[in-house]
Structure formats: structure tokens, C-alpha cells
């Protein structure tokens, strides 16, 4: 309908204003509205002026129109020529009454369709509905994806590319892990991925100063160690070191008036030489205290070694051995005196006998023909040794004896000379001072070890070897090695240790094979003035453990493998250590601190006597244990 109207209008315009000249009224009849007429007529006059000479009057007159006038006039009413719309953004241009209308393509706006709509910034369709990147384009937009993603068929959503499936060898020997938009080459903990070699490399954490004292790096990890022998233990952060603290304080008060007989593991505590008038006879008086059952109290000899007298303890009773040119005798008698009480002992050479008294009561009288020691040059020269004898004497004894004696003497009077001179020597030497109060047991001060040689192989048993251990302990610190079996290659195939528990004021007992804990008894209150009892039995097939609370046969997946390691070591030679470890690497065991406290050990039915040890640190007390420190009102 519109085009028909346009054609009619065009025909009227041709007839009225080109073939003939028209005035404004006649033009009004063609356009039938004022805006178009007002727009057309001034431009029509310009066309006429261009193609006709002289002034044009509005009076109607006939004329021959030039073809150029026709084209000039025909062009006047078309508002869409020349095109006013933005070519990129318009869909169509509509000629209006002295105006135009540009119809815009989708994505464009404005009177002339000159403004691109940024669909990515549409508040009613945020980001153009794209899941990742919205790219605006002239008149449109499209969605795109970040690296590592692909566009889905809906052209809006992105899907992660699984690089691990696409390229299985992308990480080499490491594990490929797909992550949104990317992938990661993962290594086990303690390893770092090397891009060049496409492999996992061990991180040397020790080079990064992770540990306070000692660090051992191993593939995939590291372990920190603290010097237990210097009294340190690993803190809970497993990196720093802290002092092994006392959990049960002991009364370590000593008195110089009390002479400690076990100052040396091997050797004499005190050596005295007397030069007295020849009429002198041997005499010794002293108070004596011990829990030890065997050992040398005193040994006296002549200057030429030809005569000697031994005062010792055997089976808890006084024993006297003597030898001179006339006789050779051994006598044991009296009551058992290794009761931890002070006993007054006197040994006196009489004219025809040697009298031994305990608490002033005669317990032995030994006949002797002639003097014990022969005077020479009008003098009686005598050498006196406390708690031991010269090494060469050992072979001359009538009955061998273990000379080591853990005991104390006080109020001594030798050769009726009193204690003059001796006290002064002792006063300056702390090691020679005896504890004021002691109890039965063995004391490990946390500074050394004792070594035993024990044969664990039982030929009659099908197991081949077995270790049955009973421990009675009263620890003073919560961390330390109580018992360890050490191989010749400096490994520790079995150890029983104490560690402070994570729960406050309690301890754990660890059983370990080499540096692996095979069992942990948790949270025992061992730091008390009561002794704790622990037993375990181990052979190549089983590990059984009993505490006062429970008896347990331990079994877990890894145990048989660990017992196989122990079995291999037991078939070779192992040394038994009490109270700590010898010089083995820090990484050999989970714990390397010395044990501090009282402990009695029974292995395979035999109560271990520290006096029988192959070696023992001097500070370990074989048969005496300090009492628990009692808080007094003044302290």
C-alpha cells in the first residue's frame, strides 16, 4: 500500500512540477502535508534556478523541462539519499515526511544506528551469559574460553581440557593432576618436580637448616635428631631440641665424711701408706653401709707384697682372706650386713688371732701364728687400699672375688691413726662423697651406660633365640634408652626406651627395631616414687608385652618384617647395653638420650648385677639408688 502511494506521489510530482512549473500551493496538493511541502519547495526553487534563467514567478506557465531538472527535483523528497544511517549498524532506511528512520540490526542502537551495544555489559544478561570470556564485536558478541578450556556446543560454556589424558607422558615419571585450565605434575611429599628432567627429585631439607641440631636427609623426607647424650630431646615440632627435664627430683645430697667405695668401676678409691713403729698391729674400724652383696671393702699388704689381708663382702656377709709366710686363710661369718643400714665393723689384729666385730660383737676370730705383717728395720710398713686391690693380687686370692663394691664407709680409724689426713683428701673430691640417703636398686644418672655380654641363643628352643626381660624402673627424667641390643655394624636391632608422652606428666614406652618404633605403650605415669614393672618376651616369631595393667601379644602388618631384621641380628653377635647407647649414629634409634633413674633388669631369668658388667660408666651406681627428694617446709 505504501509503495502504491509513493508511486502516485511520484507521478503527480512529475506532472505538476517537472513537466510544468508548480507554485507552493500546487506542490502542497502533491504532498498533501505541510512538513514535506515546506521541505520540498525551497529546494525545488534551487533546482529551477540551476536550470532556468531569469526570475521564476509562482504564476503557472508552460515550459519545456530539461532532463537535468527532472533528476534534480526527483531527488528532493528522498530522505534516505544520501544514506544517513551507519552502514554497519543499519538494516533499512525509511524515507519519512521530511525525515528518515534507520532501522538497526540487532546489537546496534542510536538514531543512525551508530552505537554498538556491548552485550557483555548487559545488566540483564551479565557477561553476555558467557561462562568465561565475553568478547564484544560490532553488532554482536561471542564467548571464548581461557587457556586450558574448550568451548561447548552451546557456544557459551567452557569445559576444562584434561591435559593428563591428552598427553599421558606430559609429567614424565611424576603424577599428572588435572586442574581447571591447567595441569600439575605432582611428586610425593619430600620430592620436587624438575621441569627439565620431567622427574621427581628428592628435596634436601637438611640444606635448608630445618633442624636445630642434627638432620638426616633420606629419599622423600628428613628426620631431625637431638644429642641425647648431651641431655637434649626432640621437641614436639619435630625440629627443635629441648632439654630432657627432670620429672622426679632425687635427693642427691652427699657428705664428704662419707667415703663412696664405687667411685671407680675398675680401680681403687683410696690408697694409704702407713709407716709405724714395729710394735704396731693391723687394725681397722669403720661404719659400713651397702646393698651390694659382694665386693672388696679394704685390702692391706706389706711393703714387699709378701703378706696381705682382704676384708670383703660375699653373700652379704663379711669375708676375710689372709696370707703371709705362716698361713693362708679364708673365713666368712656373721650376719648379712648388705641391708642398707650403717653397720659398725672392726678388724683387729691381736697377738694370736684376728678379731672381726660387727656392732662391737665378735663375729669371727681367726687364729694366726705370728704377726700378720713382718716389720723391717724397726718399722711396720703397710699399704691400705679401699674398695679394690692391685691388679696382680687377683691371681693370688684364695677365692676369687668381684672387687666392685657399691657402698659407703664413715668414721674410719686405720691403724689406730684416726681419720687425720684422709678427710682433707676426700673433701676436695666430689666423686668420693657418698649420698646421704640411698635405697636398694641401681641408679643411672643419665650420663653413661653399662655393657654386658649375654648369649641369647637357646639351642634347645625351636625359636633359636629369645629375649625375656623384666624391668623395674623408677625414672627421674621422662626420656631415655633403658635397654638396647647393639650389632657389630653399629645398628640397634632392639631397644626399649622411655619418652615423654604428648599427654602431660606421663610417659610412653617404645619398643624399636633399628630406627622404627614397633610398639608404643602410651601415657603411663612412670615418674612417681613407686617402681613400675614391665616385662616383655621376644623371639623371631612373637613379641609379647606385659605391664601391671595388661598382657599383650603384639601383632601388626609390619611386625614380622621387623622381627626378621631382629632375627638376622640375633643370629650374629649383639652386645647388651643398659641405660643408653654406645657411639652409634643418631639415626640408629628413635631415642638416643641416656636413661636417668633407678632400674633393675632381669634378662632370661638372670638378675643383672652391674658389678658383673664388661664396662660401666663410673657414675652408674650398681647397688644404690638416691631417694626421692621430699619437699620440706623450708625448701
Amino acid at each position: 500500500a505504501n509503495s502504491l502511494l509513493e508511486e502516485t506521489k511520484q507521478g503527480n510530482l512529475e506532472r505538476e512540477c517537472i513537466e510544468e512549473l508548480c507554485n507552493k500551493e500546487e506542490a502542497r496538493e502533491v504532498f498533501e502535508n505541510d512538513p514535506e511541502t515546506d521541505y520540498f519547495y525551497p529546494k525545488y526553487l534551487v533546482c529551477l534556478r540551476s536550470f532556468q534563467t531569469g526570475l521564476f514567478t509562482a504564476a503557472r506557465q508552460s515550459t519545456n523541462a530539461y532532463p537535468d531538472l527532472r533528476s534534480c527535483v526527483n531527488a528532493i523528497p528522498d530522505q534516505c539519499s544520501p544514506l544517513p544511517c551507519n552502514e554497519d549498524g543499519y538494516m533499512s532506511c525509511k524515507d519519512g515526511k521530511a525525515s528518515f528512520t534507520c532501522t538497526c540490526k540487532p546489537g546496534w542502537q542510536g538514531e543512525k544506528c551508530e552505537f554498538d551495544i556491548n552485550e557483555c555489559k548487559d545488566p540483564s544478561n551479565i557477561n553476555g551469559g558467557c561462562s568465561q570470556i565475553c568478547d564484544n564485536t560490532p553488532g554482536s558478541y561471542h564467548c571464548s574460553c581461557k587457556n586450558g578450556f574448550v568451548m561447548l556446543s552451546n557456544k557459551k560454556d567452557c569445559k576444562d581440557v584434561d591435559e593428563c589424558s591428552l598427553k599421558p607422558s606430559i609429567c614424565g615419571t611424576a603424577v599428572c593432576k588435572n586442574i581447571p585450565g591447567d595441569f600439575e605434575c605432582e611428586c610425593p611429599e619430600g620430592y620436587r618436580y624438575n621441569l627439565k628432567s620431567k622427574s621427581c627429585e628428592d628435596i634436601d631439607e637438611c640444606s635448608e637448616n630445618m633442624c636445630a641440631q642434627l638432620c638426616v636427609n633420606y629419599p622423600g623426607g628428613y628426620t631431625c635428631y637431638c644429642d641425647g647424650k648431651k641431655g637434649f630431646k626432640l621437641a614436639q615440632d619435630q625440629k627443635s631440641c629441648e632439654v630432657v627435664s627432670v620429672c622426679l627430683p632425687l635427693n642427691l645430697d652427699t657428705k664428704y665424711e662419707l667415703l663412696y667405695l664405687a667411685e671407680q668401676f675398675a680401680g681403687v678409691v683410696l690408697y694409704l701408706k702407713f709407716r709405724l713403729p714395729e710394735i704396731s698391729r693391723f687394725s681397722a674400724e669403720f661404719d659400713f653401709r651397702t646393698y651390694d652383696s659382694e665386693g672388696v671393702i679394704l685390702y692391706a699388704e706389706s711393703i714387699d707384697h709378701s703378706a696381705w689381708l682382704l676384708i670383703a663382702l660375699r653373700g652379704g656377709k663379711i669375708e676375710v682372706q689372709l696370707k703371709n709366710e705362716h698361713t693362708s686363710k679364708i673365713t666368712t661369718g656373721g650376719d648379712v650386713i648388705n641391708n642398707g643400714l650403717w653397720n659398725m665393723v672392726s678388724v683387729e689384729e691381736l697377738e694370736h688371732s684376728i678379731s672381726i666385730k660387727i656392732a662391737k660383737e665378735a663375729v669371727m676370730d681367726i687364729n694366726k701364728p705370728g704377726p700378720l705383717f713382718k716389720p723391717e728395720n724397726g718399722l711396720l710398713e703397710t699399704k691400705v687400699y679401699f674398695a679394690g686391690f692391685p691388679r696382680k693380687v687377683e691371681s693370688e686370692l684364695i677365692k676369687p672375688i668381684n672387687p666392685r663394691l657399691d657402698g659407703c664407709i664413715r668414721s674410719w680409724n686405720l691403724m689406730k691413726q684416726g681419720a687425720s689426713g684422709i678427710k682433707e683428701i676426700i673433701q676436695e673430691k666430689q666423686n668420693k662423697h657418698c649420698l646421704v640417703t640411698v635405697e636398694k636398686g641401681s641408679y643411672y644418672p643419665g650420663s653413661g651406660i653399662a655393657q654386658f655380654h649375654i648369649d641369647y641363643n637357646n639351642v634347645s628352643s625351636a625359636e633359636g633365640w629369645h629375649v625375656n626381660v623384666t624391668l623395674n624402673i623408677r625414672p627421674s627424667t621422662g626420656t631415655g634408652v633403658m635397654l638396647a641390643l647393639v650389632s657389630g655394624n653399629n645398628t640397634v636391632p632392639f631397644a626399649v626406651s622411655l619418652v615423654d608422652s604428648t599427654s602431660e606428666k606421663s610417659q610412653d614406652i617404645l619398643l624399636s627395631v633399628e630406627n622404627t618404633v614397633i610398639y608404643r605403650i602410651q601415657a603411663l605415669s612412670l615418674c612417681s616414687d613407686q617402681q613400675s614393672h614391665l616385662e616383655f618376651r621376644v623371639n623371631r616369631n612373637n613379641l609379647e608385652l606385659s605391664t601391671p595393667l595388661k598382657i599383650e601379644t603384639i601383632s601388626h602388618e609390619d611386625l614380622q618384617r621387623q622381627l626378621a631384621v631382629l632375627d638376622k641380628a640375633m643370629k650374629a653377635k649383639v652386645a647388651t647395653y643398659l641405660g643408653g647407647l654406645p657411639d652409634v649414629p643418631f639415626s640408629a634409634t628413635p631415642v638416643n638420650a641416656f636413661y636417668n633413674g633407678c632400674m633393675e633388669v632381669n634378662i632370661n631369668g638372670v638378675q643383672l648385677d652391674l658389678d658383673e658388667a664388661i664396662s660401666k660408666h663410673n657414675d652408674i651406681r650398681a647397688h644404690s639408688c638416691p631417694s626421692v627428694w621430699k619437699k620440706t617446709k623450708n625448701s
Epitope: D122, P123, I126
Partner: antibody, heavy 112, light 107 residues
Amino acid sequence: EVQLQESGPSLVKPSQTLSLTCSVTGDSITSGYWNWIRKFPGNKLEYMGYISFSGSTYYNPSLKSRISITRDTSKNQYYLQLNSVTTEDTATYYCAREFAYWGQGTLVTVSA
Amino acid sequence: DIVLTQSPATLSVTPGDSVSLSCRASQSISNNLHWYQQKSHESPRLLIKFVSQSISGIPSRFSGSGSGTDFTLSINSVETEDFGMYFCQQSNSWPWTFGGGTKLEIK
């Protein structure tokens, strides 16, 4: 028809955390962008942030250290958490799908 | 952040009047400017997006114009239901921001 409903405490003490829930019906929060906008007592509107259909978030930098927008697709709900609030956070809080569908708003007063 | 300033803050008109509300941006925002109406106790409603693009369901008496930094919302022959707050909002750059609003009230 998409409908959004804000819910949560109307009174929050200073220094505490403001927590609001937007429950959506008529549409799934796994499509589109889901926004939080607030209007202060003086009629000022502030755009707070969005959580998208994929779970990615955008926060207005002025709130970044305090704001968290999360969602639970199984409940078709999304959430606003604003930490360490002060009296300045007193406003009407709106949730909206794009900016075309809005909840009716909930007034939250921060006061001791 | 882009600041949008609306003027006047309040406009008092009689129903039947035609009005123009202004929104000025602190920097050019191209045509990423949208208008919202908020009546008392209601939530905002999108009226016009991208300066002049009409939203379905919105009466044709609402129209928009402008570009760059200066924009206008025109209401041809105001009706009683048109009274309330009008906000402009830009989506040119994050964070999206709103103008302070113009209150259209009955004279």
C-alpha cells in the same frame, strides 16, 4: 517466574558477621549470575558482588577483605557473609539474578 | 570507580507533565548506562538498558538518550504510578556503580 527471597537476622552487633541467605525459585543458580546489592538509609545503592553459575565470584574491591559469597546448589540458595560489621553496614540487602530479577530486600541493622 | 551524579535530587511534577532526569558520569562510559525505578517498599526495576533500549513490559512513555558522559531519562506525560526513585547505573567497568538517585514526587 524467577523469584528471590532474602532471609537472615535483622539485627547484628558491631564486629560480628552478617550472614544472609537468598533462596531462589523458578530458576537454577547453576545458570546465570547471582548478585548482592545493598541500599543505605540515604538511598545510596552499592553493588557488592556476584557468584556465577560456575561458582566463580566477584567482589567489590571496597568490601573484598570482608565479603564472601557462597552457594549450595542442592538447596538452590546462595549466601552473603560480611565480617567485622560496623554501624555503617546498616542497609537493605537485595539479592538479584542479573539486574533483571530482584528479591524484595531485607533490612539489616548493625547496632550494639 | 566511576561516579554517577544524578540531578535534580528531587523533581516535583504534576501528572500529565513531561520530565527529564539527568545522569552524568565521571568519565566516558560509552552507551553502558541503564535506568531503574524504585517505588516505596519495592525493589528496583530495570526500565531502560544501554541508554535507550526499552525493556519488555515497561510503558513506552519512558525513553532514554545520551552518550559518553551525559544521559537523560525522559517520561512523556507522567502518570501517578511513576512517582518514586530513579537510579542510573553503569556497566562500563567493574565495580558497577549507581547514581545517587532522583526522587520524582507529586507537586
